[in-house]
Interface confidence: low
């Protein structure tokens, strides 16, 4: 089932997580879970999930083999989810394989996670 908030089969809610309780006044940035590696087949759809939270809300960027990921209409896209960001690649081709990295920053700290699509 395609959803917007999880790992592997599910997606996860957004990169803009901001808790303002007395106990969380200071800035923080947390990688909630390392990115998973994915093995899939040509023509299928792959999803990579970057699960981070922080205060102020982190900005998330995606890289493939150290180069910024460029979105392609109806084929390759990324969007914020309740827990971070999700990168989706449809109609997979052999050229899509590689190392994918998400980099999150809240202006003070940076966290990153890398997954392999093969």
């Amino acid at each position: 089932q395609e959803t917007e908030l999880s790992v592997s089969a599910e997606l996860v809610p957004t990169s803009s997580w901001n808790i303002s309780s007395e106990l969380n006044k200071d800035s923080y940035l947390t990688l909630d879970e390392p990115m998973n590696n994915i093995t899939t087949s040509l023509g299928q759809t792959a999803e990579l999930h970057c699960k981070v939270s922080g205060n102020p809300p982190p900005t998330i960027r995606w890289f493939k083999n150290d180069a910024p990921v460029v979105q392609e209409p109806r084929r390759l896209s990324f969007r914020s989810t309740i827990y971070g960001s999700r990168l989706r690649i449809r109609n997979l081709d052999t050229t899509d394989t590689g190392y994918f990295q998400c980099v999150a920053t809240n202006g003070k700290e940076v966290v990153s996670s890398t997954g392999v699509l093969f």
Epitope: L5, S6, V7, E10, W17, N18, T30
Partner: antibody, heavy 114, light 107 residues
């Protein structure tokens, strides 16, 4: 099929605590966040917090001012929400919901009354 | 916290009517919005996510539009089973916040 089954209704006195359970089946608990949401009679839904059972990370709604604790027992595929220092306005139906809000527990009515 | 408002708070409609419900956020939430349907004594059911994406198993008469601060849920032709209360939820920032709901009843 995915199912979230919650514990039964509770009646508590003001100042007490309540612990509601949510047993997951049909999917892997540890790779999905679990939200807790409540709804007081005739009121809107209210998000309380979530737990990521894979590592125990939690996020809370600051409105509850430290009164909420969310835990999990991965061996039992169960998440728990405990609300302390209960007051009458905590009377509500409490729900657990899977990370993307696509599956919900049946709800647990908690009544706080002296 | 991000405040969510809905209008109307209640409305009466007939089977076959086109129904439009709006949800407004107090600040930009991008497309991080979910619409739910809830019937009395029942669990909320997710209809739309990412503001415009139809959830699995939801009839195509339901659609969502909008981004930023203004969002709309449209039921193209109201069916008897659609009489319920509809809530929006923003998941752009913590704490997640729901709208107050829009009750759709029979005219």
């Amino acid at each position: 099929q995915v199912q979230l089954v919650q514990s039964g209704a509770e009646v508590k006195k003001p100042g007490a605590s309540v612990k509601v359970s949510c047993k997951a089946s049909g999917y892997t608990l540890t790779t999905n966040y679990m939200h807790w949401v409540r709804q007081a009679p005739g009121q809107r839904l209210e998000w309380m917090g979530w737990i990521y059972p894979g590592n125990g990370n939690t996020k809370f709604n600051h409105k509850f001012d430290g009164r909420v604790t969310i835990t999990r027992d991965t061996s039992a595929s169960t998440a728990y929400m405990e609300l302390s220092s209960l007051r009458s306005e905590d009377t509500a139906v409490y729900y657990c919901a899977r990370s993307d809000f696509d599956y919900w527990g049946q709800g647990t009515l908690v009544t706080v009354s002296s | 916290d991000i405040q969510m408002t809905q209008s109307p708070s209640a409305m009466s409609a007939s089977v076959g009517d086109r129904v439009t419900i709006t949800c407004q956020a107090s600040q930009d939430i991008g497309n991080n919005l979910i619409w739910f349907q809830q019937k009395p004594g029942k669990v909320p059911k997710r209809l739309i996510y990412f503001a415009t994406s139809l959830a699995n198993g939801v009839p195509s008469r339901f659609s969502g539009s909008g981004s930023g601060t203004e969002f709309t849920l449209t039921i193209s032709s109201l069916q008897p089973e659609d009489f319920a209360t509809y809530y929006c939820l923003q998941y752009r920032e913590y704490p997640l916040t729901f709208g107050p709901g829009t009750k759709v009843d029979i005219k």
